[in-house]
Protein backbone atom coordinates (compact mmCIF):
# COMPACT_ATOMS: atom_id res chain seq x y z
CA UNK A 1 0.00 0.00 0.00
CA UNK A 2 1.46 3.33 -1.12
CA UNK A 3 0.47 6.97 -1.37
CA UNK A 4 0.13 7.97 -5.01
CA UNK A 5 -0.76 11.63 -4.46
CA UNK A 6 0.43 13.15 -1.19
CA UNK A 7 -2.09 14.83 1.11
CA UNK A 8 -2.94 18.43 0.34
CA UNK A 9 -4.91 20.41 2.90
CA UNK A 10 -6.99 23.57 3.06
CA UNK A 11 -8.21 25.34 6.20
CA UNK A 12 -11.33 27.38 6.86
CA UNK A 13 -9.15 29.37 9.30
CA UNK A 14 -11.55 28.64 12.10
CA UNK A 15 -12.13 25.05 13.03
CA UNK A 16 -11.75 22.62 10.14
CA UNK A 17 -8.93 21.71 7.80
CA UNK A 18 -9.66 19.27 5.00
CA UNK A 19 -6.93 17.01 3.64
CA UNK A 20 -7.23 14.91 0.48
CA UNK A 21 -4.91 12.32 -1.03
CA UNK A 22 -4.85 9.36 -3.38
CA UNK A 23 -3.64 5.83 -2.80
CA UNK A 24 -2.10 3.59 -5.44
CA UNK A 25 -5.18 1.40 -5.59
CA UNK A 26 -8.72 0.97 -4.24
CA UNK A 27 -8.66 1.55 -0.49
CA UNK A 28 -11.18 1.41 2.30
CA UNK A 29 -9.94 4.65 3.83
CA UNK A 30 -11.88 4.49 7.09
CA UNK A 31 -10.76 0.98 8.04
CA UNK A 32 -7.23 0.90 6.62
CA UNK A 33 -5.88 4.41 7.26
CA UNK A 34 -5.48 6.97 10.01
CA UNK A 35 -4.21 10.54 9.74
CA UNK A 36 -2.56 11.78 12.92
CA UNK A 37 -2.17 15.52 13.34
CA UNK A 38 -0.61 17.63 16.05
CA UNK A 39 -0.15 21.35 16.52
CA UNK A 40 3.51 22.19 17.04
CA UNK A 41 3.05 23.94 20.38
CA UNK A 42 3.28 23.34 24.12
CA UNK A 43 0.68 21.04 25.64
CA UNK A 44 -0.73 20.13 22.24
CA UNK A 45 -2.01 16.59 21.94
CA UNK A 46 -1.96 14.35 18.90
CA UNK A 47 -5.38 13.89 17.30
CA UNK A 48 -6.57 11.11 15.04
CA UNK A 49 -8.65 11.69 11.95
CA UNK A 50 -10.55 8.79 10.42
CA UNK A 51 -10.59 9.35 6.66
CA UNK A 52 -13.54 8.81 4.34
CA UNK A 53 -13.49 7.51 0.80
CA UNK A 54 -13.42 10.07 -1.96
CA UNK A 55 -13.60 7.96 -5.09
CA UNK A 56 -12.00 4.51 -5.44
CA UNK A 57 -8.43 5.37 -4.44
CA UNK A 58 -9.08 8.78 -2.96
CA UNK A 59 -9.37 9.65 0.73
CA UNK A 60 -10.48 12.77 2.57
CA UNK A 61 -10.07 13.72 6.23
CA UNK A 62 -11.59 16.59 8.21
CA UNK A 63 -9.18 17.79 10.89
CA UNK A 64 -10.90 19.52 13.81
CA UNK A 65 -9.15 22.47 15.42
CA UNK A 66 -10.17 24.58 18.41
CA UNK A 67 -8.74 27.79 17.06
CA UNK A 68 -6.06 29.08 14.74
CA UNK A 69 -3.34 31.72 14.76
CA UNK A 70 -1.28 32.86 11.79
CA UNK A 71 1.87 31.05 12.89
CA UNK A 72 0.26 27.63 13.37
CA UNK A 73 2.03 24.60 11.99
CA UNK A 74 0.75 21.02 12.20
CA UNK A 75 2.62 17.79 11.76
CA UNK A 76 0.75 15.17 9.74
CA UNK A 77 1.41 11.41 9.83
CA UNK A 78 -0.50 9.02 7.61
CA UNK A 79 -0.59 5.48 8.98
CA UNK A 80 -1.76 2.16 7.64
CA UNK A 81 -1.82 0.08 10.81
CA UNK A 82 1.77 0.16 12.10
CA UNK A 83 3.20 1.37 8.80
CA UNK A 84 3.98 5.07 8.36
CA UNK A 85 3.06 5.84 4.75
CA UNK A 86 3.74 9.56 4.70
CA UNK A 87 4.93 12.34 6.97
CA UNK A 88 4.40 16.03 6.33
CA UNK A 89 3.36 19.36 7.76
CA UNK A 90 0.66 21.94 7.16
CA UNK A 91 0.37 25.67 7.88
CA UNK A 92 -3.34 26.58 7.87
CA UNK A 93 -2.71 30.29 7.22
CA UNK A 94 -0.94 29.45 3.95
CA UNK A 95 -3.79 27.35 2.57
CA UNK A 96 -7.05 29.10 3.43
CA UNK A 97 -10.38 28.47 1.79
CA UNK A 98 -12.94 30.64 3.60
CA UNK A 99 -16.29 29.37 4.77
CA UNK A 100 -19.18 30.16 2.47
CA UNK A 101 -21.40 33.12 3.38
CA UNK A 102 -24.90 32.24 4.53
CA UNK A 103 -28.44 33.59 4.84
CA UNK A 104 -28.50 35.26 1.44
CA UNK A 105 -31.68 37.34 1.23
CA UNK A 106 -33.04 39.52 -1.54
CA UNK A 107 -35.09 42.46 -0.27
CA UNK A 108 -37.42 43.69 -2.98
CA UNK A 109 -39.55 46.02 -0.88
CA UNK A 110 -37.41 49.08 -1.61
CA UNK A 111 -38.78 50.93 -4.64
CA UNK A 112 -36.79 50.15 -7.79
CA UNK A 113 -33.84 48.87 -5.76
CA UNK A 114 -32.77 45.35 -4.95
CA UNK A 115 -30.96 44.93 -1.66
CA UNK A 116 -29.05 41.68 -1.26
CA UNK A 117 -27.77 40.86 2.21
CA UNK A 118 -25.90 37.85 3.57
CA UNK A 119 -24.09 36.82 6.73
CA UNK A 120 -20.36 36.91 7.31
CA UNK A 121 -19.41 33.27 7.98
CA UNK A 122 -16.91 34.19 10.73
CA UNK A 123 -17.41 35.42 14.30
CA UNK A 124 -15.93 38.83 15.24
CA UNK A 125 -12.99 37.29 17.09
CA UNK A 126 -11.71 35.67 13.88
CA UNK A 127 -9.14 37.57 11.81
CA UNK A 128 -11.05 36.89 8.60
CA UNK A 129 -14.19 38.57 9.95
CA UNK A 130 -12.85 41.99 8.95
CA UNK A 131 -10.99 40.86 5.84
CA UNK A 132 -13.53 39.18 3.59
CA UNK A 133 -14.65 40.56 0.27
CA UNK A 134 -17.37 38.98 -1.81
CA UNK A 135 -18.57 38.15 -5.29
CA UNK A 136 -22.30 38.05 -5.94
CA UNK A 137 -23.50 36.02 -8.91
CA UNK A 138 -26.93 36.83 -10.34
CA UNK A 139 -28.42 34.91 -13.23
CA UNK A 140 -31.69 34.46 -15.01
CA UNK A 141 -33.41 31.11 -14.91
CA UNK A 142 -34.89 31.85 -18.32
CA UNK A 143 -31.82 33.11 -20.16
CA UNK A 144 -28.44 31.40 -19.57
CA UNK A 145 -26.68 34.37 -21.18
CA UNK A 146 -28.07 36.70 -18.53
CA UNK A 147 -25.34 35.94 -16.01
CA UNK A 148 -23.39 38.53 -14.06
CA UNK A 149 -20.90 38.90 -11.23
CA UNK A 150 -20.79 41.88 -8.87
CA UNK A 151 -17.57 42.25 -6.91
CA UNK A 152 -18.19 43.57 -3.41
CA UNK A 153 -14.86 44.99 -2.29
CA UNK A 154 -16.12 46.71 0.86
CA UNK A 155 -16.62 44.89 4.17
CA UNK A 156 -20.38 45.23 4.53
CA UNK A 157 -22.12 42.00 3.49
CA UNK A 158 -24.65 43.65 1.23
CA UNK A 159 -25.18 44.78 -2.34
CA UNK A 160 -27.62 47.33 -3.76
CA UNK A 161 -28.51 47.26 -7.42
CA UNK A 162 -31.17 49.01 -9.41
CA UNK A 163 -33.96 46.61 -10.27
CA UNK A 164 -33.93 48.09 -13.75
CA UNK A 165 -30.49 46.62 -14.46
CA UNK A 166 -32.27 43.26 -14.60
CA UNK A 167 -35.11 42.31 -16.88
CA UNK A 168 -38.58 42.77 -15.49
CA UNK A 169 -41.14 40.03 -15.15
CA UNK A 170 -38.75 37.08 -14.92
CA UNK A 171 -37.17 35.04 -12.14
CA UNK A 172 -33.56 35.48 -11.05
CA UNK A 173 -31.29 33.59 -8.73
CA UNK A 174 -28.37 34.89 -6.68
CA UNK A 175 -25.52 33.33 -4.76
CA UNK A 176 -22.46 34.75 -3.01
CA UNK A 177 -18.94 33.60 -2.22
CA UNK A 178 -16.04 35.08 -0.24
CA UNK A 179 -12.28 35.43 -0.26
CA UNK A 180 -9.64 37.25 1.75
CA UNK A 181 -6.76 39.04 0.12
CA UNK A 182 -4.73 39.15 3.34
CA UNK A 183 -4.03 35.42 3.22
CA UNK A 184 -4.29 35.12 -0.55
CA UNK A 185 -7.08 32.62 -0.05
CA UNK A 186 -8.95 30.68 -2.65
CA UNK A 187 -12.62 31.51 -3.14
CA UNK A 188 -15.09 29.91 -0.77
CA UNK A 189 -17.79 27.65 -2.09
CA UNK A 190 -20.89 29.47 -3.30
CA UNK A 191 -23.65 30.02 -0.78
CA UNK A 192 -26.97 28.30 -1.43
CA UNK A 193 -28.81 30.32 -4.05
CA UNK A 194 -31.95 32.31 -3.46
CA UNK A 195 -34.69 33.04 -6.00
CA UNK A 196 -36.91 36.05 -6.58
CA UNK A 197 -39.23 37.41 -9.23
CA UNK A 198 -37.94 40.69 -10.62
CA UNK A 199 -40.71 43.16 -11.31
CA UNK A 200 -40.59 46.91 -11.44
CA UNK A 201 -42.51 49.65 -13.18
CA UNK A 202 -40.42 51.23 -15.93
CA UNK A 203 -41.10 54.76 -17.25
CA UNK A 204 -42.38 54.17 -20.82
CA UNK A 205 -39.87 56.46 -22.49
CA UNK A 206 -36.94 54.59 -20.90
CA UNK A 207 -38.19 51.22 -22.02
CA UNK A 208 -35.46 49.17 -23.77
CA UNK A 209 -32.93 51.99 -23.46
CA UNK A 210 -30.91 50.59 -20.57
CA UNK A 211 -27.34 49.56 -21.25
CA UNK A 212 -26.56 46.40 -19.28
CA UNK A 213 -23.04 45.67 -18.10
CA UNK A 214 -22.44 41.97 -17.78
CA UNK A 215 -19.45 41.24 -15.62
CA UNK A 216 -17.96 37.85 -16.33
CA UNK A 217 -15.72 36.26 -13.71
Amino acid sequence: MKVLQEPTCVSDYMSISTCEWKMNGPTNCSTELRLLYQLVFLLSEAHTCIPENNGGAGCVCHLLMDDVVSADNYTLDLWAGQQLLWKGSFKPSEHVKPRAPGNLTVHTNVSDTLLLTWSNPYPPDNYLYNHLTYAVNIWSENDPADFRIYNVTYLEPSLRIAASTLKSGISYRARVRAWAQCYNTTWSEWSPSTKWHNSYREPFEQHHHHHHHHHHH
Partner: antibody
Framework: EVQLVQSGAEVKKPGATVKISCKAS????????MHWVKQAPGKGLEWVGR????????IYASKFQGRATITADTSSNTAYMELSSLRSEDTAVYHC?????????WGQGTLVTVSS | DIVMTQTPLSLSVTPGQPASISCRSS???????????LEWYLQKPGQSPQLLIY???NRFSGVPDRFSGSGSGTDFTLKISRVEAEDVGVYYC?????????FGQGTKLEIK
Protein backbone atom coordinates in the same frame (compact mmCIF):
# COMPACT_ATOMS: atom_id res chain seq x y z
CA GLU B 1 9.97 26.50 31.75
CA VAL B 2 7.04 28.57 30.52
CA GLN B 3 6.82 32.00 32.15
CA LEU B 4 5.05 35.30 31.62
CA VAL B 5 6.91 38.02 33.50
CA GLN B 6 5.16 41.37 33.80
CA SER B 7 6.59 44.81 34.48
CA GLY B 8 6.47 46.30 37.96
CA ALA B 9 3.79 48.24 39.79
CA GLU B 10 2.85 51.69 38.53
CA VAL B 11 1.38 54.74 40.26
CA LYS B 12 -0.28 57.23 37.90
CA LYS B 13 -2.31 60.42 38.15
CA PRO B 14 -5.84 60.64 36.72
CA GLY B 15 -5.76 61.43 33.01
CA ALA B 16 -2.32 59.89 32.52
CA THR B 17 -1.38 56.88 30.41
CA VAL B 18 0.25 53.66 31.57
CA LYS B 19 1.95 50.98 29.48
CA ILE B 20 2.70 47.61 31.03
CA SER B 21 4.69 44.77 29.51
CA CYS B 22 4.57 41.00 29.58
CA LYS B 23 7.65 39.06 28.47
CA ALA B 24 7.19 35.42 27.57
CA SER B 25 9.80 32.72 27.87
CA UNK B 26 9.58 29.01 27.12
CA UNK B 27 7.30 29.59 24.13
CA UNK B 28 6.86 31.92 21.18
CA UNK B 29 4.02 34.42 21.56
CA UNK B 30 3.38 34.11 17.81
CA UNK B 31 1.95 30.67 18.57
CA UNK B 32 -0.77 32.01 20.88
CA UNK B 33 -3.26 34.77 21.47
CA MET B 34 -2.13 37.15 24.21
CA HIS B 35 -4.91 38.45 26.45
CA TRP B 36 -5.16 40.97 29.27
CA VAL B 37 -7.45 40.51 32.27
CA LYS B 38 -8.27 43.14 34.89
CA GLN B 39 -8.81 42.48 38.59
CA ALA B 40 -9.84 45.44 40.71
CA PRO B 41 -8.97 45.22 44.46
CA GLY B 42 -11.17 42.60 46.12
CA LYS B 43 -13.12 42.10 42.88
CA GLY B 44 -13.45 39.47 40.20
CA LEU B 45 -11.81 38.96 36.83
CA GLU B 46 -12.70 41.09 33.81
CA TRP B 47 -11.55 40.43 30.25
CA VAL B 48 -9.95 43.47 28.59
CA GLY B 49 -8.92 42.26 25.13
CA ARG B 50 -6.50 40.19 23.10
CA UNK B 51 -4.02 40.25 20.23
CA UNK B 52 -2.79 37.80 17.61
CA UNK B 53 0.90 38.79 17.80
CA UNK B 54 1.68 37.68 14.24
CA UNK B 55 -0.75 39.96 12.43
CA UNK B 56 -1.54 42.45 15.20
CA UNK B 57 -5.27 41.73 15.08
CA UNK B 58 -6.87 42.97 18.30
CA ILE B 59 -10.30 42.79 19.86
CA TYR B 60 -11.44 44.53 23.03
CA ALA B 61 -14.30 44.49 25.47
CA SER B 62 -16.48 47.49 24.60
CA LYS B 63 -15.77 49.00 28.03
CA PHE B 64 -12.08 49.29 27.14
CA GLN B 65 -12.40 50.04 23.42
CA GLY B 66 -10.69 53.33 22.63
CA ARG B 67 -8.76 53.52 25.90
CA ALA B 68 -6.88 50.22 25.88
CA THR B 69 -4.31 49.42 23.21
CA ILE B 70 -2.76 45.96 23.10
CA THR B 71 0.40 45.50 21.06
CA ALA B 72 3.04 42.83 20.66
CA ASP B 73 6.69 42.75 19.66
CA THR B 74 7.46 39.29 18.36
CA SER B 75 11.20 39.99 18.16
CA SER B 76 11.39 40.45 21.94
CA ASN B 77 8.55 37.97 22.61
CA THR B 78 6.71 40.64 24.58
CA ALA B 79 3.08 41.79 24.74
CA TYR B 80 2.02 45.23 25.95
CA MET B 81 -1.12 46.92 27.18
CA GLU B 82 -1.48 50.68 27.23
CA LEU B 83 -4.36 52.29 29.10
CA SER B 84 -5.02 55.99 28.58
CA SER B 85 -7.14 58.67 30.26
CA LEU B 86 -6.71 56.86 33.56
CA ARG B 87 -9.32 57.23 36.28
CA SER B 88 -9.58 55.90 39.82
CA GLU B 89 -11.66 52.89 38.77
CA ASP B 90 -8.74 51.71 36.63
CA THR B 91 -6.85 50.89 39.83
CA ALA B 92 -6.37 47.15 39.54
CA VAL B 93 -4.02 44.28 38.95
CA TYR B 94 -3.69 43.57 35.22
CA HIS B 95 -2.74 40.04 34.18
CA CYS B 96 -1.39 39.02 30.81
CA UNK B 97 -2.48 35.54 29.80
CA UNK B 98 -1.63 33.33 26.86
CA UNK B 99 -4.59 31.46 25.40
CA UNK B 100 -4.20 28.45 23.19
CA UNK B 101 -7.06 27.78 23.25
CA UNK B 102 -7.55 28.26 27.01
CA UNK B 103 -5.82 30.38 29.63
CA UNK B 104 -3.06 27.97 30.57
CA UNK B 105 -0.34 30.50 31.45
CA TRP B 106 -0.82 33.66 33.51
CA GLY B 107 1.56 36.47 34.33
CA GLN B 108 2.06 37.41 37.98
CA GLY B 109 0.03 40.60 37.49
CA THR B 110 0.93 44.28 37.48
CA LEU B 111 -0.69 46.61 40.01
CA VAL B 112 -1.69 49.95 38.51
CA THR B 113 -2.73 52.54 41.06
CA VAL B 114 -4.47 55.70 39.88
CA SER B 115 -4.38 58.40 42.50
CA SER B 116 -4.14 62.17 42.60
CA ASP C 1 -22.65 40.73 26.34
CA ILE C 2 -23.06 37.25 27.80
CA VAL C 3 -23.49 37.36 31.56
CA MET C 4 -22.10 34.43 33.54
CA THR C 5 -23.89 34.00 36.87
CA GLN C 6 -22.34 31.81 39.56
CA THR C 7 -24.09 30.34 42.60
CA PRO C 8 -23.41 30.27 45.44
CA LEU C 9 -21.09 33.25 45.87
CA SER C 10 -19.51 31.68 48.93
CA LEU C 11 -19.19 28.14 50.18
CA SER C 12 -17.92 26.71 53.46
CA VAL C 13 -17.11 23.01 53.28
CA THR C 14 -15.75 20.44 55.70
CA PRO C 15 -12.61 18.67 54.40
CA GLY C 16 -13.52 15.39 52.72
CA GLN C 17 -17.02 16.59 51.85
CA PRO C 18 -18.20 17.37 48.30
CA ALA C 19 -18.77 20.84 46.89
CA SER C 20 -20.64 22.04 43.85
CA ILE C 21 -20.63 25.39 42.05
CA SER C 22 -23.15 26.34 39.39
CA CYS C 23 -22.57 28.67 36.47
CA ARG C 24 -25.36 29.86 34.21
CA SER C 25 -24.84 31.83 30.98
CA SER C 26 -27.40 34.38 29.80
CA UNK C 27 -27.38 32.76 26.34
CA UNK C 28 -25.92 29.73 24.62
CA UNK C 29 -22.13 29.59 24.64
CA UNK C 30 -21.76 27.15 21.80
CA UNK C 31 -19.14 28.63 19.46
CA UNK C 32 -19.86 28.79 15.73
CA UNK C 33 -17.35 25.94 15.32
CA UNK C 34 -19.59 23.72 17.46
CA UNK C 35 -17.42 23.68 20.59
CA UNK C 36 -18.40 25.05 23.98
CA UNK C 37 -15.55 27.04 25.48
CA LEU C 38 -16.62 26.95 29.11
CA GLU C 39 -13.72 26.91 31.55
CA TRP C 40 -13.19 26.92 35.30
CA TYR C 41 -10.33 28.73 37.05
CA LEU C 42 -9.20 28.75 40.66
CA GLN C 43 -7.48 31.75 42.16
CA LYS C 44 -5.74 30.81 45.38
CA PRO C 45 -5.03 33.59 47.89
CA GLY C 46 -2.21 35.83 46.67
CA GLN C 47 -1.79 33.96 43.37
CA SER C 48 -2.76 34.34 39.74
CA PRO C 49 -5.69 32.21 38.56
CA GLN C 50 -5.00 28.67 37.35
CA LEU C 51 -6.89 26.57 34.84
CA LEU C 52 -8.86 23.61 36.17
CA ILE C 53 -11.35 22.59 33.47
CA TYR C 54 -11.64 23.45 29.77
CA UNK C 55 -14.36 22.75 27.22
CA UNK C 56 -16.88 21.99 29.99
CA UNK C 57 -15.54 18.60 31.06
CA ASN C 58 -11.80 18.33 30.34
CA ARG C 59 -9.39 18.43 33.27
CA PHE C 60 -6.21 20.40 32.60
CA SER C 61 -2.92 18.55 33.08
CA GLY C 62 -1.95 18.19 36.72
CA VAL C 63 -5.45 18.92 38.03
CA PRO C 64 -6.56 16.27 40.57
CA ASP C 65 -9.37 13.98 39.46
CA ARG C 66 -11.54 15.11 42.37
CA PHE C 67 -12.40 18.09 40.14
CA SER C 68 -14.98 17.49 37.44
CA GLY C 69 -17.02 19.66 35.11
CA SER C 70 -20.37 19.03 33.48
CA GLY C 71 -23.23 20.79 31.74
CA SER C 72 -24.41 21.99 28.35
CA GLY C 73 -26.30 24.82 26.71
CA THR C 74 -26.45 27.47 29.41
CA ASP C 75 -26.07 25.46 32.65
CA PHE C 76 -22.69 24.26 33.90
CA THR C 77 -21.37 22.79 37.13
CA LEU C 78 -18.00 22.33 38.79
CA LYS C 79 -17.88 19.54 41.35
CA ILE C 80 -15.21 18.73 43.89
CA SER C 81 -15.79 15.20 45.12
CA ARG C 82 -13.79 15.56 48.34
CA VAL C 83 -12.66 19.04 49.32
CA GLU C 84 -9.09 19.41 50.61
CA ALA C 85 -7.48 22.32 52.45
CA GLU C 86 -5.50 23.31 49.35
CA ASP C 87 -8.73 23.90 47.39
CA VAL C 88 -9.48 27.20 49.14
CA GLY C 89 -9.75 30.26 46.96
CA VAL C 90 -12.10 31.86 44.47
CA TYR C 91 -13.50 29.79 41.60
CA TYR C 92 -14.46 31.50 38.34
CA CYS C 93 -16.32 30.16 35.34
CA UNK C 94 -15.44 31.73 31.99
CA UNK C 95 -16.88 31.67 28.50
CA UNK C 96 -14.49 32.00 25.56
CA UNK C 97 -17.03 31.32 22.84
CA UNK C 98 -18.38 34.79 22.12
CA UNK C 99 -16.74 38.22 22.20
CA UNK C 100 -16.56 39.88 24.65
CA UNK C 101 -15.34 36.92 26.67
CA UNK C 102 -16.74 37.00 30.19
CA PHE C 103 -16.07 35.60 33.65
CA GLY C 104 -18.53 34.72 36.35
CA GLN C 105 -18.42 36.88 39.46
CA GLY C 106 -16.57 34.21 41.45
CA THR C 107 -17.37 31.74 44.22
CA LYS C 108 -15.27 31.84 47.38
CA LEU C 109 -14.55 28.42 48.88
CA GLU C 110 -13.57 28.25 52.53
CA ILE C 111 -12.77 25.30 54.75
CA LYS C 112 -14.90 24.77 57.86
Amino acid sequence: EVQLVQSGAEVKKPGATVKISCKASGFNIKDTYMHWVKQAPGKGLEWVGRIDPTNGYTIYASKFQGRATITADTSSNTAYMELSSLRSEDTAVYHCVSRRPWFAYWGQGTLVTVSS
Amino acid sequence: DIVMTQTPLSLSVTPGQPASISCRSSQSIVHSNGNTYLEWYLQKPGQSPQLLIYKVTNRFSGVPDRFSGSGSGTDFTLKISRVEAEDVGVYYCFQGSHVPYTFGQGTKLEIK
